[in-house]
């Protein structure tokens, strides 16, 4: 399933426009709206940003917010992987990273977030209406997938407000119930909106919550709040998906990861500075495909999953036994 919701980034009107009471009643609906739209903890976020310096260059950042350890991340474009999308990169915490053109650099940013730089020209260049999807797998608990895209009108040179372009897959089991408080809040929100419909709407402002201020940010409400929508699954059509990528399959047999130090697919790429990587603002979260059950253990802290020989917090001595990686 996919559903779309256009929820602009809003700032309350300036205090001078209304009295304190009016200001509070105007702020409240937007707080409630946020609660209603993001009901149920979001699990995956996606950011898509076009670089101002190179219009053909995109940066996709994805992260997983659950407590479980991630066993695989797949980034695709043209739609979700397995539903018309084409794989751009596969990142495994232990067995390394594999990527396909026009992906230039895929890397782990933290234990639970990744980034991918895309660039190209001509047929292999991504375009503004391309949908990018990130799928985080945590075996055996399940997989969570979220998608986002740049709006076609994005101008990287301008400080445009974040444009929500969410795509939500909610076709799987394990949908979380929305709490009664939130349901009440949503009803109350509708009531407030009806009371205030004669008043002018608050002004749209660029979001100032993210330190990076990406040019475009994709996000979607959580699965819980969308479970009843039953929107048909529609794939965004994009004309710039290169035909050459259709033959790129990450599951090409158990040979390409080989052993970490020797195989080209696992060439160490320097530790990811995950401790200092700013996590995107909550407004940029994208929702989950399916949130499932409790996770079977945390992954120990490390700098570059699959790219570091001694990720164990105990240091190199951990390599003495057979359990030395991740």
């Amino acid at each position: 399933m996919r559903t779309e919701a256009q929820v602009p980034a809003l700032q309350p009107p300036e205090p001078g426009l209304e009295g304190a009471m009016g200001h509070r009643t105007l702020v409240l609906p937007w707080v409630l709206l946020t609660l209603c739209v993001t009901a149920g903890t979001p699990e995956v976020w996606v950011q898509v940003r076009m670089e101002a310096t190179e219009l053909s260059s995109f940066t996709i950042r994805c992260g997983f917010l659950g407590s479980g350890s991630i066993s695989l991340v797949t980034v695709s474009w043209g739609g979700p992987n397995g539903a018309g999308g084409t794989t751009l990169a596969v990142l495994h915490p232990e067995r390394g990273i594999r990527q396909w053109a026009p992906a230039r650099q895929a890397r782990w940013e933290t234990q639970s977030s990744i980034s991918l730089i895309l660039e190209g020209s001509g047929a292999s260049s991504p375009c503004a209406n391309t949908t990018f999807c990130c799928k985080f797998a945590s075996f055996p608990e399940g997989s969570w997938e979220a998608c986002g895209s740049l709006p076609p009108s994005s101008d990287p040179g301008l400080s445009a407000p974040p444009t929500p372009a969410p795509i939500l897959r909610a076709d799987l089991a394990g949908i979380l119930g929305v709490s009664g408080v939130l349901l009440f809040g949503c009803v109350y929100l509708l009531h407030l909106l009806r009371r205030h419909k004669h008043r002018p709407a608050p002004r749209l402002q660029p979001s100032r919550t993210s330190p990076q201020a990406p040019r475009a940010r994709a996000w979607a409400p959580s699965q819980a709040s969308q479970a009843a929508l039953h929107v048909p699954y529609a794939t965004i059509n994009t004309s710039c998906r290169p035909a050459t990528l259709d033959t790129a399959h990450p599951h090409g047999g158990p040979s390409w990861w080989a052993s970490l130090p020797t195989h080209a697919a696992h060439r160490p790429q320097g530790p990811a500075a995950w401790a200092s990587t700013p996590i995107p603002a909550r407004g940029s979260f994208v929702s989950v495909e399916n949130g499932l059950y409790a996770q079977a253990g945390e992954r120990p802290p490390h700098t570059g999953p699959g790219l570091t020989l001694f990720p164990d917090p105990r240091g190199p001595r951990a390599m003495e036994g057979p359990l030395g990686v991740r």
């Epitope: 797998a137 399940g142 089991a173 599951h251 399916n290 059950y293 359990l323």
Partner: antibody, heavy 120, light 106 residues
Framework: EVQLQQSGPVLVKPGASVKMSCEPS????????VNWMRQSHGKSLEWIGV????????SYNQKFKGKATLTVDKSSSKINMELNSLTSEDSAVYYC?????????????WGQGTSVTVSS | QIVLTQSPAIMFASPGEKVTMTCSAS?????MHWYQQKSGTSPKRCIS???KLASGVPARFSGSGSGTSYSLTISSMEAEDAATYYC?????????FGSGTKLELK
């Protein structure tokens, strides 16, 4: 060549416990999950649980929590499963199998199975 | 848990005949895997990720489906294909297997 070698058949009395092992070879031990299944005679497969050797953290089918315990023996690179409070219903062939992340977690290699017979 | 129902439970096919068996899930799943098990042996992976042919498996095997309905097809039955076939999902914990379809040579 990838192989998962399981321990031999066992005959135990009701109420007793049994420990069986699965020894992977031919691949990097820490890179793959190892699942355990059971198959009673003439019946389908039941998933018991899975363990990731890198940290020894198991995840169980709720049905087998308290019945099965999955552990990793780091010194011998073996994955063990202990079954307790055995009854005749636990008589079955128990399989270990490797899951491949890059293949949708399909179980691409299986052990030969360990036959457990619970009888007084 | 997600229940996988396979049909038919048992089927007979002549050599060269096209065989299709189905696996129906009680709720939507993202992938389906298929395994072949011959009497007295361990299961062997046939199809993974719904439609990917496992290495060493003949091209006459194919898989398809989405959501709650999946199928395994053998384009031309051969004697060595006689076995029990199981579908398996991992979309939600616990992983579950189908009840199995026993394919016998007619």
């Amino acid at each position: 060549e990838v192989q998962l070698q399981q321990s031999g058949p066992v005959l135990v009395k009701p109420g007793a416990s049994v420990k069986m092992s699965c020894e992977p070879s031919g691949y990097t031990f820490t890179h793959y999950y190892v699942n355990w299944m059971r198959q009673s005679h003439g019946k389908s497969l039941e998933w018991i649980g899975v363990i990731k050797p890198y940290n020894g953290a198991p995840s169980y089918n709720q049905k087998f929590k308290g019945k099965a315990t999955l552990t990793v023996d780091k010194s011998s690179s073996k994955i063990n499963m202990e079954l307790n409070s055995l009854t005749s219903e636990d008589s079955a062939v128990y399989y270990c199998a490797r899951s491949d992340d890059f293949d949708g977690y399909a179980m691409d290699y299986w052990g030969q199975g360990t036959s457990v017979t619970v009888s007084s | 848990q997600i229940v996988l129902t396979q049909s038919p439970a048992i089927m007979f096919a002549s050599p060269g005949e096209k065989v299709t068996m189905t696996c129906s899930a009680s709720s939507s799943v993202s992938y389906m895997h298929w395994y072949q098990q011959k009497s007295g042996t361990s299961p062997k992976r046939c199809i993974s990720d719904t439609s990917k042919l496992a290495s060493g498996v003949p091209a006459r095997f194919s898989g398809s489906g989405s959501g709650t309905s999946y199928s395994l097809t053998i384009s031309s039955m051969e004697a060595e294909d006689a076995a029990t076939y199981y579908c398996q999902q991992w979309t939600s914990n616990p992983l579950t297997f189908g009840s199995g379809t026993k394919l016998e040579l007619k």
